[in-house]
């Protein structure tokens, strides 16, 4: 199944327009903005969710833009090109014709430049940092208690393989879950680091891109976990290229 | 050829304590995760424990109450099961049974089995 | 926790015949159902994952369909072989489970 036949919805894009024209009158679903359709036994990429989310009425966005704490991803949202496949085109350029490269969750590698700028490639983000910091609690989690829960949690709730979830680190309050995940390593089928890394961010902000499933509702031992804030670095198989200018 | 194969299961008195083995061949014990499931006489399946080896990671039915422990020793392919305070109701054939590898947690691969029983 | 309800308890076919077993979830489990055959004094053998998916080794005559939280599992024309309990079981979560599996359905095959 794609999608749920029964009332023709996509659970793991609610950001999707789905209609029973699939062959046989089957359910198929079709991201917003882009007009592609969607495996709805998996999660979207996020390319398409970046374009669907800009894709919105301005005055009907629920979703907000990303706060001052991303140090990483700070170019905001921008309307992406995605490729046939949903992935990130390695080139984006906006309105005015500036144009960037990205890694293959979209963030910016290069300095900004014209229509000349040249990028040959898709370079893959490998390794992802989720640092969060939690809200206080009577007592420190449990380390291996919360180790496993957030692997059951990218386990069932994004499909990412615990192989995937590298390690785990935790020193109260903050938390660290480290992605990894190489272009050799990444089978067909495989969820993709990045686009499990982007659900889980909406997830923690209350912005759930999940259709009829709850919230995200994190528990410990049956304590609550409440994230106050979420830091997400990024490293690329090839490191990025940015001009001594910026780094000054 | 893969293979599970559990033993340490026998005749154990109420109150009492057993530890069952399950030993994996022909596979890498850490590609998977692997669970305990028994079966009491004439009953269905009842799932206890799963154990993710690599990490360590546990999970118990809601029912376990922290009387059964689940583990692994990863060099030797064995994944374990205490049995602690055991009553007549844990009276049951042991499996021990091995996800698909995927996401989700089917079994695809079950030992035959290890019979305990708990009588005075 | 998602609960699992098995109908029928027991069922009889004939040989050549249609048999259809069904599982309940109480909660939506999407896709992520598994069904397993018995025998006696044996442990059991998976049939069906993600709710259609034949496992390797496994007949056609054996389907499963269904999607959210109703099931079903159809044996195609019964053979002898195939007298056995049947199982359900959840493979969405872990979490707070008490018991993924079913009660299970005896096919008696006449």
């Known amino acids: 199944h794609t999608a749920a036949q029964d009332n023709c919805t996509c659970p793991t894009n609610k950001m999707t327009v789905c209609s029973p024209d699939g062959p046989g009158g089957r359910c198929q679903c079709r991201a917003l903005g882009s007009g592609v359709a969607v495996d709805c036994s998996t999660l979207t990429s996020k390319c398409l969710l970046l374009k669907a989310r800009m894709s919105a009425p301005k005055n009907a966005r629920t979703l907000v833009r990303p706060n001052e704490h991303a140090l990483v991803d700070n170019d905001g949202l921008y309307d992406p090109d995605c490729d046939p496949e949903g992935r990130f085109k390695a080139r984006q350029c906006n309105q005015t014709s500036v144009c960037w490269c990205v890694n293959s969750v979209g963030v910016r590698r290069t300095d900004k430049g014209d229509l000349s700028l040249r990028c040959d490639e898709l370079v893959r983000t490998h390794h992802i940092l989720i640092d969060l910091r939690h809200r206080p609690t009577a007592s420190a989690f449990n380390h291996s208690d919360l180790d496993a829960e957030l692997r059951r949690l990218f386990r069932e709730r994004y499909r990412l393989h615990p192989k995937f979830v590298a390690a785990v680190h935790y020193e109260q309050p903050t938390i660290q879950i480290e992605l990894r995940q190489n272009t050799s390593q990444k089978a067909a089928g495989d969820v993709d680091i990045g686009d499990a890394a982007y659900y889980f961010e909406r997830d923690v902000k209350g912005e759930s891109l999940f259709q009829g499933r709850g919230g995200l509702d994190l528990r410990v031992r049956g304590e609550p976990l409440q994230v106050e804030r979420t830091l997400i670095y990024y490293l690329d198989e090839i490191p990025p290229k940015f001009s001594m200018k910026r780094l000054t | 050829q893969e293979q599970l194969k559990e033993s340490g299961g026998g005749l154990v008195q109420p109150g009492g304590s057993l530890t069952l083995s399950c030993k994996a061949s022909?596979?890498?014990?850490?590609?998977?995760?692997v669970s305990w499931v028994r079966q009491a006489p004439g009953k269905g399946l009842e799932w206890i424990a799963y154990?993710?080896?690599?990490?360590?990671?546990?999970y118990y039915a809601t029912w376990v109450n922290g009387r059964f422990t689940i583990s692994s020793h990863n060099a030797q392919n064995t994944l374990y099961l205490q049995l602690n305070t055991l009553t007549a109701a844990d009276t049951a054939t042991y499996f021990c049974?091995?996800?698909?590898?995927?996401?989700?947690?089917?079994?695809?691969?079950w030992g035959p089995g290890t019979l305990v029983t708990v009588s005075s | 926790d998602v609960v699992m309800t098995q109908t029928p308890a027991s069922v009889e076919a004939a040989v050549g015949g249609t048999v259809t077993i069904n599982c309940q979830a109480s909660?939506?489990?999407?896709?992520?159902l598994a069904w397993y055959q018995q025998k006696p004094g044996q442990p059991p053998k998976l049939l069906i994952y993600?709710?259609?998916k034949l496992a390797s080794g496994v007949s056609s005559r054996f389907s499963g369909g269904g999607y959210g939280t109703e099931f079903t599992l159809t044996i195609s024309g019964v053979e002898c072989a195939d007298a056995a309990t049947y199982y359900c079981?959840?493979?969405?979560?872990?979490?707070?489970?008490?018991?993924?599996f079913g009660g299970g359905s005896e096919v008696v095959v006449k």
């Open positions: 049974a091995r996800d698909a590898g995927g996401t989700d947690y089917n079994f695809n691969l």
């Open positions: 022909g596979f890498d014990f850490n590609n998977y995760g």
């Open positions: 154990i993710y080896p690599t990490y360590h990671n546990t």
């Open positions: 909660q939506s489990i999407e896709s992520y």
């Open positions: 993600e709710a259609s």
């Open positions: 079981q959840q493979a969405l979560t872990i979490g707070n489970v008490d018991n993924p």
